[in-house]
């Protein structure tokens, strides 16, 4: 059952798996939730009546019944991990502690102009953990504006005191505000030769790649797969670091695959969700519980549907036997991995994907494409919604994109002449606009956020926010698109289409089926070229065809350029402007999403 | 005219690296992406990857991630294809080709430069 | 990724001749099709795009067409300057992939 509430003056006794120091309650219970085994915690607050040195302490749990006798105690804060919880999750925390120093490795240390420019350096600084600031008001003279960047190997702090005129923070990695580039790839036939600060077991390559990006001080990882020739070493997964923050040494062995750490990136990548089925492969852990299933999708679901299970093997039935239910063996270890990967015995192993939900949601894997044809088919599009206007008469304005449960990014020049969100209607699910009617459920606009460097579309900053009054419920049909990250600046996006229901041709009407189109992308110096009468800045995005045929055109604004990138769909442009539509070398001018990252973010988790 | 200037034909170790260029001229070189494209002996083509000259944004084919790196110099209007960790199968007549978009034919190619690799 | 396969190798063709190649994807490519000539010694150069587009310059002999899957190069009235080796290549998605290539020889 999930409980969020803190309980304040109260202890859970006994059940102790491990102590971090957190500077809060509730970034204990963060802590808490992303800890493989954590199910309940007990966090220490300041107070004259303890021990100065238990403040800050959060002490993580566990219990095999999923809860531990209360205790009263003064200053005690307890809770549960969000684990047991259906909400998404998010590691991210912005706040700024006020006359706390956080203790770590002080790696680097350097003058700012503030606690928000340290904060921004030490999110920029691919070691960087969290940081500590002292403020011009700092009595020793030489440490005023110095900024400590900070790391420790659990990523966490080694202690907290209390200290007068220093802040103290969090790197903002998580909150998908790093600049730092992404290394998406993985090298096969490669071993980077440098130290190992962890090692566990991996089915394969992505698992491990994943499990270096959530583990702290991972930055690049190796993983032995399992025709490695050193039988004790088969499905190990290396997870390495240097001072430099890349591999010293690059050896070229076979069987071996090695990649980078995707911290910076992974708002826009499946981290925790390790979902494929790993057939005639047996995990080995410690054992929960053993129940019958009909299937390993169904025994994924048990596993699922067990707050401690953390992966698991089937073994199929027997032909006839126990109603052709074979045996669910659910796990679970000290770090959430198994403690040893078997091959050849018949079973079919996965993981609980319970943990999904610490993923962002628009990494979810979504119905294969249509090739072929204009037209597209219910579900292919998820975040596509259409925006209606119902003033003088309702009618389709413009499109947009679903970017979070209460959130759609569409194009600032949709808006001329809107006088209030009042009058707007977003419809999200939609495939055709036939399907609309008066009793068709819609998500009011409480706000609409403008970019306010905005004059017209051509000059840029075509970009603008609706917060709906209600939250969007995910559904097949209706799911967010991932942001593109910053660190994939130097990415070129190959496999985009823009989608809306606007004119096929310059003198048209709305259509009433989504359409869509693959439309490569072009330079921006090709873009400036065909535009002499307007700047093409870097936050300007062209596509298009050299012999033109293929565009977005009227009613296709604020909609979507999504570009599918390592099997996750990115909204990299905004429908914006052109010269006529899918005319000879006149491309498309989309928002380049990228550049107004810190913007949506900004607007979009301001409190 | 149009015209893609190839570096002259390599001779290398095993294990080393090399880097061939490909000079641009006749058009707007950041207005292009460059594509680098591998024909070994008597084989056909083998796409390596392509760059956007405009901003050094890049793709590469995942068979030769790790393998090549790709890097433009706009002043000098010039492309390059790094290789690293050199074998024999890595001996091969390499290409370079522009295209204009992300999406389309490549129109124009270079002569071709020569990469013997030997022990 | 996508195959292309070009299931001729070689073709020997009577000067004058009309002359028919092959090209099938393993998946739809929507006409993202480029074929280009090769001659011995040379680089290749693009003779089509958009799998019937002809490029300046290139004679009207040739030409190109197909959808889907499966497309073709036909050369009407065949020249000596034509024996060369051809290649289909797709753009529809990356990595962007090569026929085999089809030799063209006169009889």
């Known amino acids: 059952e999930c409980v969020t509430q803190l309980l304040k003056d109260t202890c859970f006794e006994g059940g102790d798996i491990t102590t971090v120091f957190t500077p809060s309650a509730k970034y204990c219970q963060v802590v808490c939730t992303y800890h493989p085994r954590c199910l309940l915690f007990t966090f220490t607050a300041e107070s004259p009546s303890e021990d100065p040195t238990r403040w800050f302490t959060c002490v993580l749990k566990d219990s095999v019944t999923e809860t531990l006798p209360r205790v009263n105690r003064t200053a005690a804060i307890s809770g549960y991990s969000f684990k047991q919880c259906s909400h998404q999750i998010s590691a991210c925390n912005k706040d700024i502690y006020v006359d706390l120093d956080m203790k770590g490795i002080n790696y680097n240390s350097s003058v700012a102009k503030s606690a928000q420019e340290c904060q921004e350096r030490c999110t920029d600084d691919v070691h960087c953990h969290f940081f500590t600031y002292a403020t011009r008001q700092f009595p020793s003279l030489e440490h005023r504006n110095i900024c400590l960047l900070k790391h420790t190997q659990t990523g966490t702090p080694t202690r907290i005191t209390k200290l007068d005129k220093v802040v103290s923070g969090f790197s903002l990695k998580s909150c998908a505000l790093s600049n730092l580039a992404c290394i998406r790839d993985i090298f096969p036939n490669t071993v980077f030769a440098d130290s190992n600060i962890d090692s566990v077991m991996a089915p394969d390559a992505f698992v491990c790649g994943r499990i270096c990006t959530h583990h702290p001080g991972c930055l690049f990882f190796t993983f032995f797969s399992q025709e490695w020739p050193k039988e004790s070493q088969r499905n190990l997964c290396l997870l390495k670091t240097s001072e430099s923050g890349l591999p010293s040494t690059r050896i070229k062995k076979s069987k071996a695959l090695s990649g980078f750490s995707l911290q910076s990136c992974r708002h826009s990548i499946p981290v925790f969700c390790h979902s494929s089925f790993y057939h005639d492969t047996d995990f080995l852990g410690e054992e929960l519980d053993i129940v019958a299933a009909k299937s390993h999708e169904a025994c994924q679901k048990l596993c699922t549907n067990a707050v401690r299970c953390q992966f698991f093997t089937y073994t199929p039935a027997q032909a006839s036997c126990n109603e052709g239910k074979g045996k669910c063996y659910l796990k679970l270890s000290s770090n959430g991995s198994p403690t040893k990967i078997l091959h050849g015995r018949g079973g079919i192993s996965g993981y609980t994907l319970r943990l999904c939900k610490m993923d962002n949601e628009c990494t979810t894997k979504i119905k294969p494409r249509i090739v072929g044809g204009t037209a597209s088919v219910r579900g292919e599009w998820p975040w596509q919604v259409t925006l209606h206007t119902t003033s003088p008469t309702q009618r389709h304005l413009c499109g947009g994109s679903i970017i979070g449960n209460q959130w759609i990014l569409t194009a600032a020049h949709c808006f001329y002449g809107v006088e209030s969100p009042k009058i707007l209607r977003v419809y999200s699910g939609i495939l055709n606009q036939s399907e609309i009617k008066e009793d068709t459920s819609f998500f009011g606009v409480q706000e609409i956020i403008i970019h306010d460097q905005y004059k017209m579309a051509e000059s840029g900053y075509d970009i603008a926010l609706l917060k709906l009054e209600t939250t969007v419920n995910y559904t097949d049909s209706q799911r967010p698109i991932c942001l593109p990250s910053k660190g994939d600046r130097n990415v070129i996006y190959t496999d985009c289409w823009v989608t809306g229901w606007g004119y096929r041709k310059l003198r048209d009407k709305i259509q009433n089926t989504l359409q869509k189109a693959k439309i490569p992308l072009v330079t921006n110096e090709e873009c400036q070229k065909r535009y002499r009468g307007h700047k093409i800045t870097h936050k300007m995005i062209c596509a298009g065809y050299r012999e033109g045929g293929k565009d977005a055109c009227k009613g296709d604004s604020g909609g979507p350029l999504s570009c599918k990138h390592n099997e996750v769909w990115h909204l990299v442009g905004i429908t914006s402007w052109g010269e006529g539509c899918a005319q000879r070398e006149r491309p498309g001018v989309y928002t380049n999403v990228v550049e107004y990252v810190d913007w949506i973010l900004e607007k979009t988790q301001a409190v | 005219e149009v015209k893609l200037q190839e570096s002259g034909p390599e001779l290398v170790k095993t294990g080393a690296s090399v880097k061939i260029s490909c000079k641009a001229s006749?058009?707007?070189?950041?207005?292009?992406?460059m594509n680098w494209v591998k024909q070994s002996h008597g084989k056909s083509l083998e796409w390596i990857g392509f760059?956007?000259?405009?901003?050094?944004?890049?793709s590469y084919n995942q068979k030769f991630k790790g393998k090549a790196t790709f890097t433009v110099d706009a002043s000098s209007s010039s492309a390059y294809m790094q290789f690293n960790s050199l074998t024999s199968e890595d001996s091969a007549v390499y290409y370079c080709a522009r295209t204009i978009s992300t999406g389309d034919s490549f129109d124009y190619w270079g002569q071709g430069s020569t990469l013997t690799v030997s022990s | 990724d996508i195959v292309m396969t070009q299931s001729t190798s070689y073709l020997s063709v009577s000067l004058g001749g009309r002359v028919t190649i092959t090209c099938k994807a393993s998946d739809h490519i929507n006409n993202w099709l480029a074929w280009y000539q090769q001659k011995p010694g040379d680089a290749p150069s693009l003779l089509i795009s958009g799998a019937s587009r002809l490029e300046t310059g290139v004679p009207s002999r040739f030409s190109g067409s197909g959808s889907g899957k499966d497309y073709t190069l036909s050369i009407t009235s065949l020249q000596t300057e034509d024996v060369a080796t051809y290649y289909c290549q797709q753009y529809w998605t990356t990595p962007f992939t090569f026929g085999s290539g089809t030799k063209l020889e006169i009889k």
């Open positions: 760059i956007n000259c405009y901003n050094g944004a890049t």
């Open positions: 006749g058009y707007s070189f950041t207005g292009y992406f």
